[in-house]
């Protein structure tokens, strides 16, 4: 799996999980989240060469198509596979509220 | 939706469905499929600017992060959303066999 266990341990130019810390105030301009101040969002990036972690029949076909037709621009792309939620604390007036924001943290990647 | 109805009618540099016909023999080197000789596989390509058809909270966050940090390389990517199967006819020796290959045709795209 193209997850932290594999990607953060290996120098990998191909599609892999990349570390990315997002500071809510500085990076998003969000002042409304009280805690945490930021989080490890991570992101997916890297080349999708011949059948590298292709996730569907179509992406495998496209990968093979690109190998045989190297001038083609129709190549798979490195995107998130497994995502996890992030629990945040914010205030509605003086009232604290805990919320779980779905699909905020990327845990693994794929070529799609 | 970034599907044929929208994308094939508009000239669109941003993430959209692109037409792609794949000839099994010529483009994949496959001689084993008898019918069809090829099919409209389509593919997804184009830029994913701020909030252009972002499909998850993470991709929306990443999109906003990129707007505020334009030097960052952590941008969403244009990939397939809805896929459809393709029915093929092939032969096992002299015996014809019909098979449905899943996720072979891209019908719409998203920024992920």
């Amino acid at each position: 799996a193209l997850d932290a266990a594999y990607c953060f341990r290996n120098v990998q130019d191909n599609c892999c999980l990349r570390p990315l810390y997002i500071d809510f105030k500085r990076d998003l301009g969000w002042k409304w989240i009280h805690e945490p101040k930021g989080y490890n969002a991570n992101f997916c990036a890297g080349a999708c060469p011949y059948l590298w972690s292709s996730d569907t029949q179509h992406s495998r076909v496209l990968s093979l198509y690109n190998t045989i037709n190297p001038e083609a621009s129709a190549s798979p792309c490195c995107v998130s596979q497994d995502l996890e939620p992030l629990t945040i604390l914010y205030y509605i007036g003086k009232t604290p509220k805990i919320e779980q924001l779905s699909n905020m943290i990327v845990k693994s990647c794929k070529c799609s | 939706a970034l599907d044929a109805a929208y994308c094939f009618r508009n000239v669109q540099d941003n993430c959209c469905l692109r037409p792609l016909y794949i000839d099994f023999k010529r483009d994949l080197g496959w001689k084993w499929i008898h019918e069809p000789k090829g099919y409209n596989a389509n593919f997804c390509a184009g830029a994913c600017p701020y909030l252009w058809s972002s499909d998850t909270q993470h991709s929306r966050v990443l999109s906003l992060y990129n707007t505020i940090n334009p030097e960052a390389s952590a941008s969403p990517c244009c990939v397939s959303q809805d896929l459809e199967p393709l029915t093929i006819l092939y032969y096992i020796g002299k015996t014809p066999k019909i098979e449905q290959l899943s996720n072979m045709i891209v019908k719409s795209c998203k920024c992920s």
Epitope: L51, T67, I68 | W32, I92
Partner: antibody
Amino acid sequence: EVQLVESGGDLVKPAGSLRLSCVASGYTFSSNVMSWVRQAPGKGLQWVGYVIPIVDIANYADAVKGRFTISRDNAKNTLYLQMNSLRVEDTAVYYCTRTLGLVLDAMDYWGQGTLVTVSS
Amino acid sequence: ETVLTQSPGTLSLSPGERATLSCRASQSLGSSYLAWYQQKPGQAPRLLIYGASSRAPGIPDRFSGSGSGTDFTLTISRLEPEDFAVYYCQQYADSPITFGQGTRLEIK
């Protein structure tokens, strides 16, 4: 130049398991159906099964059905034969082969073979 | 399954002679679902003929195949020393693929 190189053959006890590998080079691996063929010592050839590229449709000889599994890692240009519940009669040289193009077809390239011995 | 019977079991000939090997199927294969292979001791089989009569790339033209239905023939027009080996026919008209038991071609 097309090359198929098998590995993984060994001496194994009855009911044991073994995985054979076949690394292909010199052509676009995912364009051809691949098969395994075996040959018992001093005997003739016996087809084991095939796998179709990308879509991973596989079919097996009755003698190995339910015990053997053919798979492929297209990114690594590698074909596998997972053999479980091995029997004495599975003792043979196992060849990895490339078919000409159809699902059932003549086999234009063969590996050098790897010997599997099942004995207690 | 389709049974292939090769004859003769052993063929003893001298270099320069003509060799005729037979392969009979238990049911009709049509005209193009038969292949011939050559195997030398300690080596993998080598494809000679496919589609009953098409020569594989790099195979000398002294090798030829013919036949359809249930009866097929491999002919070696003029035997060379390197031709002495075991020859197998293979059918791929029906699953499972089957092979003949082989014909051993030996030097007389």
